[in-house]
Structure formats: structure tokens, C-alpha cells
């Protein structure tokens, strides 16, 4: 079958890194600079991806494979094949359309990306707060109050936020 197909279609003989040039009697021509073909039998070469601005080159383009990009420091990749770059924030912040904003009281983010998440509610598991939460860290839950021996005490749970808003700077 392969032999039959190659007799019928001379382009099927063109390997990756070349294209079947109709202007030159279907001769296999090398891909021009800044282009590639990753499979054989192609009639055109694809333009190489350019990694510029928010993107930087992770792997150079070759005649047989596209360039691969990642993000310039200060940003991180999103999407398949790093199709987008998104701004990093500090721990204790989340990214909004207004830029990086501090987590509201009662929420935390321990990463440079993602959203602020509510502190764990220890009382739902019948436990007490051992270590208070911060903008950067979740609360640490301890044993339930009943498990504590007489005279021992746990850290008082944080007071609820009076109103929505960002933590004091």
C-alpha cells in the first residue's frame, strides 16, 4: 500500500523537515528558515512559534519541531503548551483585574498563583484552633476542646471579619 501510495503521490516521500514543492515539480524542498514540518508528506511548512515579550524560548524551533515557550520570570504558564502567561503574586495575595491584591481576612493563599481560600473551620471537625491563620497560611487545628486536659487551653479562634475587605497592609 505504501509503495502504491508513493507512486500515486510523490509528496508522500517527503520526510519531516521538508515540504512538497508544487512550484518545483513536487520536489521535496527543505523548510525555509523559521518554519518546520513535523510529519512527512506536507505541502507546506508551518511558521515557528515566536517566544517574545511575556514569553521566552524553552526550546528552539528546528526544521522538524516547533519552538516551545515558557514565561518570563514574574509570570507563569497557563493552558496547553504554555499558550498564555499570567502574572505571579506574592503569597498572601490573589490576582484580580486590578493586579495583585491581599487576601481578605479569613482567607489565605500559600502560593504565587491561584485564589485566596477560606481558612479551615476547625469547629466543623469538632476541633479547636491550635495556630491562627494568616494571609499566607491556613489555621492549624488541634485536638477537640474535650480532649484537652483540665487547665490546658487552646488558642482562641479568630474573631469573624466585621466586613468584607482586604486585610490591613
Amino acid at each position: 500500500f505504501e509503495r502504491t501510495r508513493s507512486l500515486q503521490d510523490p509528496c508522500s516521500n517527503c520526510p519531516a523537515g521538508t515540504f512538497c514543492d508544487n512550484n518545483r515539480n513536487q520536489i521535496c524542498s527543505p523548510c525555509p528558515p523559521n518554519s518546520f514540518s513535523s510529519a512527512g508528506g506536507q505541502r507546506t511548512c508551518d511558521i515557528c512559534r515566536q517566544c517574545k515579550g511575556v514569553f521566552r524560548t524553552r526550546k528552539e524551533c528546528s526544521s522538524t519541531s516547533n519552538a516551545e515557550c515558557d514565561c518570563t520570570p514574574g509570570f507563569h504558564c497557563l493552558g496547553a503548551g504554555c499558550s498564555m502567561c499570567e502574572q505571579d503574586c506574592k503569597q498572601g495575595q490573589e490576582l484580580t483585574k486590578k493586579g495583585c491584591k491581599d487576601c481578605c481576612f479569613g482567607t489565605f493563599n500559600d502560593q504565587k498563583r491561584g485564589i485566596c481560600r477560606p481558612w479551615t473551620n476547625c469547629s466543623l471537625d469538632g476541633k479547636s484552633v491550635l495556630v491562627n491563620g494568616t494571609k499566607e497560611r491556613d489555621v492549624v487545628c488541634g485536638p477537640s476542646p474535650a480532649d484537652l486536659s483540665p487547665g490546658a487551653s487552646s488558642v482562641t479562634p479568630p474573631a469573624p471579619a466585621r466586613e468584607p475587605g482586604h486585610s490591613p497592609q
Partner: nanobody, 123 residues
Framework: EVQLVESGGGLVQPGGSLRLSCAAS?????NYWMNWVRQAPGKGLEW???????????YYVDSVKGRFTISRDNAKSSLYLQMNSLRAEDTAVYFC????????????????SGQGTTVTVSS
């Protein structure tokens, strides 16, 4: 081909002004949020400002608030950054960047940016 081309950079004294431009082509400019980001020498990339599709929402990093103004002209497929009261710390390569599909809804990713234009603030 989707393209963004920045211009307008140069050498300016502290306290001076510059207006950066970004010419967009290959896509429907008026459908996208647009951004300016910058990279100071030896530093990481920093987001500077963004503007929504019709120009009714504009946001800035704290360090440029009251000094920089982002604007756009959808008829000309152009983005601008008016920079006043420039400081030495504004020295950087400035990039125009497009907010990807769904920007502001489920992400704040940038999917296309230009080669950049260099702004140097020095006496």
C-alpha cells in the same frame, strides 16, 4: 498573523513625559482586554496597566497610579501609555500584551505580546 508592535520609547530626563503606542493587527482589537507590562534591567516582568474592550475600565500597578494613563483607539487598533513624571525606576522595556480569551473571567493570562520598546529615564 496576530501582531503587536510597540513604539515611542526613548531617553527622557526624570520628571519628563513619554507616550508609548502599540499597533495591533491580525485580530479584532476591540474584542480584547489589553495590557502594558515592563521589564527593568536584571528584573522580572511586572504588570503595569490594563484596559477593557471599550476603555471603561482601567487599572494600574500602585507604583504608576496618578502618573501613567492607559488608553485605546479601537478604530485605529491602537493601545497607548501616557507616562508623566517619569522616575529612574521606570526605566524598562515596555511590552504591549493581549489578554487571552476569557481574560477577567477565569484567568488573567496574556497570550500575545510584542518585541517591546525601551524607556530610559536618566539625567
Amino acid at each position: 498573523e496576530v501582531q503587536l508592535v510597540e513604539s515611542g520609547g526613548g531617553l527622557v530626563q526624570p520628571g519628563g513625559s513619554l507616550r508609548l503606542s502599540c499597533a495591533a493587527s491580525g485580530f479584532t482589537f476591540s474584542n480584547y482586554w489589553m495590557n502594558w507590562v515592563r521589564q527593568a534591567p536584571g528584573k522580572g516582568l511586572e504588570w503595569v496597566a490594563n484596559i477593557n474592550q471599550d476603555g471603561s475600565e482601567r487599572y494600574y500597578v500602585d507604583s504608576v497610579k496618578g502618573r501613567f494613563t492607559i488608553s485605546r483607539d479601537n478604530a485605529k487598533s491602537s493601545l497607548y501609555l501616557q507616562m508623566n513624571s517619569l522616575r529612574a525606576e521606570d526605566t524598562a522595556v515596555y511590552f504591549c500584551a493581549r489578554g487571552g480569551e476569557g481574560y477577567g473571567i477565569d484567568h488573567y493570562g496574556l497570550d500575545v505580546s510584542g518585541q517591546g520598546t525601551t524607556v530610559t529615564v536618566s539625567s
